[in-house]
Structures are given as C-alpha cells and as structure tokens.
Interface confidence: low
C-alpha cells in the first residue's frame, strides 16, 4: 500500500531509488538528490522534488508577478535546503552566500541578503491561484462539468481533500483553480496544497512525476482540455517583505 511491493517502485514519485531493505523487507524509496526516505503512499514534498530535479539537467522558467501580495516563481529553479520532514527551510542560500526567505512552497518572499539574513519562521502559503488558458475548442466547456472534473482530478490523482479546492472559475478560455489551506485546517496526513499544485503544474507541462503513469489526459465530457499557458500565484498568511525598489 506504499512503495509497490512487487517490483519495488514508488508510484507517486519516479525521481526515487527504491530497494527492498526497509523494515520487514518492505520496499523503501529515497528521493534523488537528498537521499531522504519518502512515503510512496502520498505526494512527495515540493522541496524534495526540486532537490531531485536539481540532480538532473536544469531548465529554468520565468513567470510574471501580477499584484502586490501575490507571489510567482520568478527565480526559477534552485537547489533548496529541506528540513528532515522534507519541507523548505525558511532561509535558503546559494553557493555564493546570497540568502533569502521563502514561503512553504519555496518561493522567495524577501529581498536577497547575505548570511546574516534572518528568516524566523516558514510562512505558510495558504491560498494558491492556478491560472490556466486552454486551447481553442469548438465551444466553451460547461462550467459545472469543468468544475467537477478538476475537483475529481485533485481528489483522485493528487489525493487532495476536496475541502481544499475552494473554487473553480471559468471565463473562456481562462480557468482559475483556487486552493485554500490554512495552517489550522491542515491535519497530519493531509496533502499540502503547494505539493498538489506542483504535481499539477508538472503534469500540465507533460513532465509527470508519477511512476509509469501516462501523462495527464484531462477531458471534460470526452472533450480534451489542452492547456497552453499556466500561471500560479501564491498568497502567504503573512504578506511578503520586499523593498519598495522591487515593487516599482
């Protein structure tokens, strides 16, 4: 029920090395890059996935920042520091001793500084807005069908509790999926919205993280939903701290 016992693989994370030498001879899988053991019955944390990705060829990406408090991942890929439970450490530094603070999805939320920079706590990203533009279709999708299909996707593929999918908005050709999860709402064992959003983002790009599964085949009443652009906005429980220079 965790790492697949028959051939010892990790169904939820193909960026792992697995061997049958865990407790009781069970299949145990470790993330590439960090070597940390992962629970293959659920999604692997974004931090460990980014770390694993950095042990493979790099391909940076750029997004744009739309508003005052919403963050997007403008900095592209970096090799993150993860804590023993796989979460991002609040302070990240590169090899040239440039440091910055990140939120729970690993996105920078302060200006860059030096090793004296303090990041007192890992600030939780409690609201994620996934903005999609779909390719032209014969007609608009039925909103309620689209809503139901996307909620099913997050529930079944990413194991995200339905209560964390706050809304699905649709104005052809733009789809917005709102994920909300406050610290107080997230129980042990709940998939983190940041991890679900990251898996979804990689799926949409045709870079599925799931072992052996085909790519994401999204259909609404049999009609393929093909995404041509994705933007993800992150809102933190505490607003980010950037200097005025950056905001102008």
């Amino acid at each position: 029920h965790t790492a697949a016992q028959d051939n010892c693989t990790c169904p939820t994370n193909k960026m792992t090395v697995c061997s049958p030498d865990g407790p009781g001879g069970r299949c145990q899988c470790r993330a590439l890059g960090s070597g940390m053991a992962v629970d293959c019955s659920t999604l692997t944390s974004k931090c460990l996935l980014l770390k694993a990705r950095m042990s493979a060829p790099k391909n940076a990406r750029t997004l744009v920042r739309p508003s005052e408090h919403a963050l997007v991942d403008n900095d592209g890929l970096y090799d993150p520091d993860c804590d023993p439970e796989g979460r991002f450490k609040a302070r990240q530094c590169n090899q040239t001793s440039v440091c910055w603070c990140v939120n729970s999805v690993g996105v920078r939320r302060t200006d860059k500084g030096d090793l004296s920079l303090r990041c007192d706590e890992l600030v939780r990203t409690h609201h994620i807005l996934i903005d999609l533009r779909h390719r032209p279709t014969a007609g608009a999708f039925n909103h309620s069908d689209l809503d139901a299909e996307l909620r099913r996707l997050f529930r079944e593929r990413y194991r995200l509790h339905p209560k964390f999918v706050a809304a699905v908005h649709y104005e052809q050709p733009t789809i917005q999926i709102e994920l909300r999860q406050n610290t107080s709402q997230k129980a042990a064992g709940d998939v983190d919205i940041g991890d679900a959003a990251y898996y979804f983002e990689r799926d949409i790009k045709g870079e599925s993280l799931f072992q052996g599964r085909g790519g994401l085949d999204l259909r609404v009443r049999g009609e393929p939903l093909q995404v041509e652009r994705t933007l993800i906005y992150y809102l933190d429980e505490i607003p980010p701290k950037f200097s005025m220079k950056r905001l102008t």
């Epitope: 029920h1 965790t2 061997s19 030498d21 865990g22 407790p23 009781g24 069970r26 145990q28 470790r30 070597g35 940390m36 053991a37 992962v38 629970d39 019955s41 659920t42 023993p84 129980a187 042990a188 064992g189």
Partner: antibody, heavy 121, light 107 residues
Framework: QVQLVQSGAEVKKPGASVKVSCKAS????????MQWVRQAPGQGLEWMGW????????KYAEDFKGRVTISLDTSTSTAYLQLSSLKSEDTAVYYC??????????????WGQGTLVTVSS | DIVMTQSPSSLSASVGDRVTITCKAS??????VAWYQQKPGKAPKLLIY???YRYTGVPSRFSGSGSGTDFTLTISSLQPEDFAVYYC?????????FGQGTKLEIK
C-alpha cells in the same frame, strides 16, 4: 536475521545518567528509523523519541526534552539513548525498536530485548 | 497528544473463543494504528500495522479493522499461546502514543 541487541542492565543513583546502546544487524541500518520506548514495572508502553538514521535528526517526546539524547554511530550500526538527571520513577525496561521514516511507517516491527535500568539510592 | 483508550482493560476467555479488543483515539488518526502482543518478560511483538495489515509471520486468526477514531483487533479462534497483553498504538503523528493495554487471561 534482523535483530537489535541492547546493552546490559544498569543500576544508577538518583541524579546520575545512563546510556543504553542498541546494535542493529541483518539490514541496512540507515534505511530504518530507530525508536525508543520504555515500560515501568507493571505499566504500559511509553514512547520517548526516535532518530532518523539517514539524516541523524532526533525527535523527542515533550516529557523527556532536556533529559534525553538519542544518537547514532552509523559505522557500527548502533543507536544510543542517554537519559540524565535520573529519578526513581525512571526505573523501567528501555526498548529500542525499528521503524520506517515517515508517519505511515512509525510502527515497530523489530524490538531489542530490553535493558532494565534501576534507579535507587 | 492523541490519547488511545483500549477496552476492556482485561478479559477472560477460553481456547477457541473469538475475542475482540477495541481502541479509541481521541482524534482522527486515519488508519495509522498498530497492534502489539506482549508476554511477561518479553519485548512486544508487532501483529497489525496501518489498522488492517497483518505483519509478516503473524497467524491469520489475527485481524485488524477501523479508521478515524475506532479500531478493533480480533482473534478469531484463541490458541493457548495467545494469552498475553495487547497494546494499540497510533503511528499518525508524534508523540506516538499507546493504549494502556488489554490483558487477555485464560478463563
């Protein structure tokens, strides 16, 4: 076969410290967590803490924080539990037990034979 | 901390009987519950993990069920070697916690 062998019984005076060892064999030491549980005479089981043998990071139960240290010697596949400022109520059998790393695996599939620690003046 | 409450605290039964021990968690622990058997002077032995998965080598007469807050260990037909103390444990979140134990005695 997989086994955990613990150090022998100890008799300590109040205020002293004790260090119990747990040597693992029959599996790759760094692929499983090591948990510590104690059982006072005639009582139930009480979790003290665990250590991720891969990262070396320990986690302690609140009741023991400041008094307990869990450590490793990966070269000898040995885990250690040190308990300081001993009191008479620390008299118990101390067990090491193997687990996985994540919460899905925090059950104990292999146990040491136990080490009786007696605290008496 | 999550409190695990076992019942009964003791019970008497005969060889061949069907016995059920229950464990109630003070909050939702999904299916993260394990069951152990302990005999006098010995270390506990794992019987069931993740509520219903029988550990390697454990006889099929032992079974576990439940999710959320209510869990059950069932021994379908008691054997002489089954008389012991049984503990439940939640492995959902630290601090890991055990039930107070159920002593199963010969009637």
């Amino acid at each position: 076969q997989v086994q955990l062998v613990q150090s022998g019984a100890e008799v300590k005076k109040p205020g002293a410290s004790v260090k119990v060892s747990c040597k693992a064999s029959g599996y790759t030491f760094t692929t499983a967590g090591m948990q510590w549980v104690r059982q006072a005479p005639g009582q139930g089981l009480e979790w003290m803490g665990w250590i991720n043998t891969h990262s070396g990071v320990p986690k302690y139960a609140e009741d023991f924080k400041g008094r307990v240290t869990i450590s490793l010697d990966t070269s000898t596949s040995t885990a250690y539990l040190q308990l300081s400022s001993l009191k008479s109520e620390d008299t118990a059998v101390y067990y090491c037990a193997r687990s996985g790393f994540g919460s899905s695996y925090w059950y104990f599939d292999v146990w040491g034979q136990g080490t009786l620690v007696t605290v008496s003046s | 901390d999550i409190v695990m409450t076992q019942s009964p605290s003791s019970l008497s039964a005969s060889v061949g009987d069907r016995v059920t021990i229950t464990c109630k968690a003070s909050q939702d622990v999904s299916t993260a519950v394990a069951w152990y058997q302990q005999k006098p002077g010995k270390a506990p032995k794992l019987l069931i993990y993740s509520a219903s998965y029988r550990y390697t080598g454990v006889p099929s007469r032992f079974s576990g069920s439940g999710s959320g807050t209510d869990f059950t260990l069932t021994i379908s037909s008691l054997q002489p070697e089954d008389f012991a103390v049984y503990y439940c444990q939640q492995h959902y979140i630290t601090p890991l916690t055990f039930g107070q134990g159920t002593k199963l005695e010969i009637k």
